[in-house]
């Protein structure tokens, strides 16, 4: 057993060396080890074949080190590995696409808070058993086509707290088992109409705290199992372009956050879901070029990149151009009591799923690596109401395993000592 480690055999053969100030993977790790805990050290490099002798290894924790480089063959020979935690290694920045090849039994991979700027082609190739992929709080700007194509058993994909600006057509191809997709706190301005085509089992989609002004309902159509949708804290344009989304939300049977309008000014702060169809008229004048839902070639429908309803001959275009009424009462940043809940002024009683602020929370001890607000915008503080609570897996046995999700903020949790401790 390496000097800084503790080794024991029951109930699993374990080599445990956490927070020992180790600067390298120790030599002499017992070959029979089924679990290796190396978290919280000062390891900066994982050389090739570091664990090759440990053929029975199922759990490897290398989180909270100072990893800057992982050799492509670092995990060679670990055919039985099920859980690999590399999170909290902010200097890592990139991972060789061959690093995880051969890990055919891997079911959980933690790569959150690793400073990742891109996902190289084929990075997740062959990880057919993977169920949980943690990529949150990195610096990812794009989702390359077919990145997750081989992950047919993936159920949870955490991509929040990155710098992703669009969701292209093939970003999520192959994710036929995906239950939960977290894309909040990014810079997403565009979602391709076919981006979610393979996500027929998706139950939870978080898109709050992005840069969406519109969302093609064609993208939502394949989401037959969707139960929880969060769209708050986006600059929604509630004019004729929002009619399809409005109609989809009226029919949606699941739980959804508020969808607060940014434009036109007369509807600012109002919830799209609670507007009447005839509120959604004309074309709001934006303070800059209109960004279409998807930047593709011009069509007969949208010859100028503008929806048909916004073209000069559109019958209802004038209503938004008239002098607007004052912005609606109700602060877009305050939670609202849904109809049927307790009357104003009476905050007691049960809290319901739509009655509170939701999003990035103040006071996190370890904020995300990246400030994920669009450039020039203020941080959300207390974003618009989303669901009060996050109902998670539909399983009712209360066993969370990897299943449960907390609320919006990111980071390592808490702010140290409590009052009175």
């Amino acid at each position: 057993c390496p000097g800084a480690c503790v080794c024991y055999n029951e109930p699993k053969v374990t080599t445990s060396c956490p927070q020992q100030g180790l600067q390298a993977v120790p030599v002499g790790i017992p070959a029979a080890s089924q679990r290796i805990f190396l978290h919280g050290n000062r390891i900066s490099h994982v050389p090739a074949a570091s664990f090759r002798a440990c053929r029975n290894l199922t759990i490897l924790w290398l989180h909270s080190n100072v990893l800057a480089r992982i050799d492509a063959a670092a995990f060679t020979g670990l055919a039985l590995l099920e859980q690999l935690d590399l999170s909290d290694n902010a200097q890592l920045r990139s991972v060789d696409p061959a690093t995880f090849h051969g890990l055919g039994r891997l079911h959980t991979l933690h790569l959150d808070r690793c400073g990742l700027q891109e996902l190289g082609p084929g990075l997740f190739r062959g990880l057919a058993a993977l169920q949980y992929l943690y990529l949150q709080d990195n610096a990812l700007q794009a989702l390359p086509d077919d990145t997750f194509r081989d992950l047919g058993n993936l159920t949870h994909l955490f991509l929040h707290g990155n710098r992703i600006s669009s969701v292209p057509e093939r970003a999520f191809r192959g994710l036929h088992s995906l239950d939960r997709l977290l894309l909040h706190q990014n810079r997403v301005a565009h979602v391709h109409p076919h981006a979610f085509r393979d996500l027929g089992r998706l139950m939870t989609l978080y898109l709050f705290a992005n840069n969406l002004s519109a969302l093609p309902t064609e993208a939502l159509a394949p989401l037959r199992a969707l139960q929880y949708l969060r769209l708050n804290d986006n600059p929604w344009v509630c004019d004729c372009r929002a009619r399809p989304l409005w109609a989809w939300l009226q029919k949606f049977r699941g739980s959804s956050s508020e969808v607060p309008c940014s434009l036109p000014q007369r509807l600012a702060g109002r919830d799209l879901k609670r507007l009447a169809a005839n509120d959604l008229q004309g074309c709001a004048v934006a303070t800059g070029p209109y960004h279409p839902i998807w930047t593709g070639r011009a069509t007969d429908e949208e010859p100028l990149g503008l929806p048909k309803c916004c073209q000069p001959d559109a019958a209802d275009k004038a209503s938004v151009l008239e002098p607007g009424r004052p912005a609606s009462a109700g602060n877009a940043l305050k939670g609202r009591v849904p109809p049927g809940d307790s009357p104003p002024g009476n905050g007691s009683g049960p809290r319901h799923i739509n009655d509170s602020p939701f999003g990035t929370l103040p006071g996190s001890a370890e904020p995300p690596l990246t400030a994920v607000r669009p450039e020039g915008s203020e941080p959300p503080g207390f974003p618009t109401s989303g669901p009060r609570r996050r109902p998670g897996c539909s399983r009712k046995n209360r066993t969370r395993s990897h299943c449960r999700l907390g609320q919006a903020g990111s980071g390592g949790g808490g702010t140290g000592d409590s009052e009175g401790s």
């Epitope: 949150q136 006071g363 969370r400 999700l405 907390g406 903020g409 949790g413 702010t415």
Partner: antibody, heavy 125, light 107 residues
Framework: QMQLVQSGAEVKKPGASVKVSCKVS????????IHWVRQAPGKGLEWMGG????????VYAQKFQGRVTLTDDTSTDTAYMELSSLRSEDTAVYYC??????????????????WGRGTMITVSS | DIQMTQSPSSVSASVGDRVTITCRAS??????LAWYQQKPGKAPKLLIY???RLQSGVPLRFSGSGSGTDFTLTINSLQPEDSATYYC?????????FGQGTRLEIK
């Protein structure tokens, strides 16, 4: 700075009820998942109940089911724990605590990271 | 309910020693375990969550590891202020359950 400020100590007769408050500052109550834990003199920690953010409901330990009620007043950011039909073995310090998991997204972070100072409830005839 | 069993129930060690406390769950809880420190007359303080994640502000001499059913809290280079009772808690499902506690005394 996050704080949970609890109401003061009370002495109660057997059969009576007690309602302990836990005022949140630094956050709004609707952002948090609050749980209650008690500790009898010289004994260990015992979870009583709290908000389950997975199922959007308040859950209780079986032992206290029917005797304990957890409520919130979001207008004052105060959580309450009411325990009825008190008996001498309910003499304990009652703590409210914040569930850290509610603040995080990956949710390998479930734990009680902030606690109130505790409220001593003595049940004696 | 998941039973949590800590051992030893009490331990006495000297400043500078290394102390290990173990916690065993009656069923697999993956890595969903927290450790708390409690000093007399005070509220518990979170040390470690998710079996191995060190809570902000907690000294590096505290470390946690384990998964499945067996977990350990290790205190390297024991300090006088570490005299306290330590509790594990499973956070995998409801009801949340605590171990019975381990009392650590400094010789």
């Amino acid at each position: 700075q996050m704080q949970l400020v609890q109401s003061g100590a009370e002495v109660k007769k057997p059969g009576a009820s007690v309602k302990v408050s836990c005022k949140v500052s630094g956050y709004t109550l609707s952002e948090l998942s609050i749980h209650w834990v008690r500790q009898a003199p010289g004994k260990g920690l015992e979870w009583m109940g709290g908000f389950d953010s997975e199922d959007d409901e308040t859950v209780y330990a079986q032992k206290f089911q029917g005797r304990v009620t957890l409520t919130d007043d979001t207008s004052t950011d105060t959580a309450y724990m009411e325990l009825s039909s008190l008996r001498s073995e309910d003499t304990a310090v009652y703590y409210c605590a914040r569930d850290l998991g509610y603040l995080t997204s990956g949710n390998y972070y479930d734990a009680f990271d902030f606690w109130g100072r505790g409220t001593m409830i003595t049940v004696s005839s | 309910d998941i039973q949590m069993t800590q051992s030893p129930s009490s331990v006495s060690a000297s400043v500078g020693d290394r102390v290990t406390i173990t916690c065993r769950a009656s069923q697999d809880i993956n890595r969903w375990l927290a450790w708390y420190q409690q000093k007399p007359g005070k509220a518990p303080k979170l040390l470690i969550y998710a079996a191995s994640r060190l809570q902000s502000g907690v000294p590096l001499r505290f470390s946690g590891s384990g998964s499945g059913t067996d977990f350990t809290l290790t205190i390297n280079s024991l300090q006088p202020e570490d005299s306290a009772t330590y509790y594990c808690q499973q956070t995998n499902n409801f009801p949340r359950t605590f171990g019975q506690g381990t009392r650590l005394e400094i010789k």
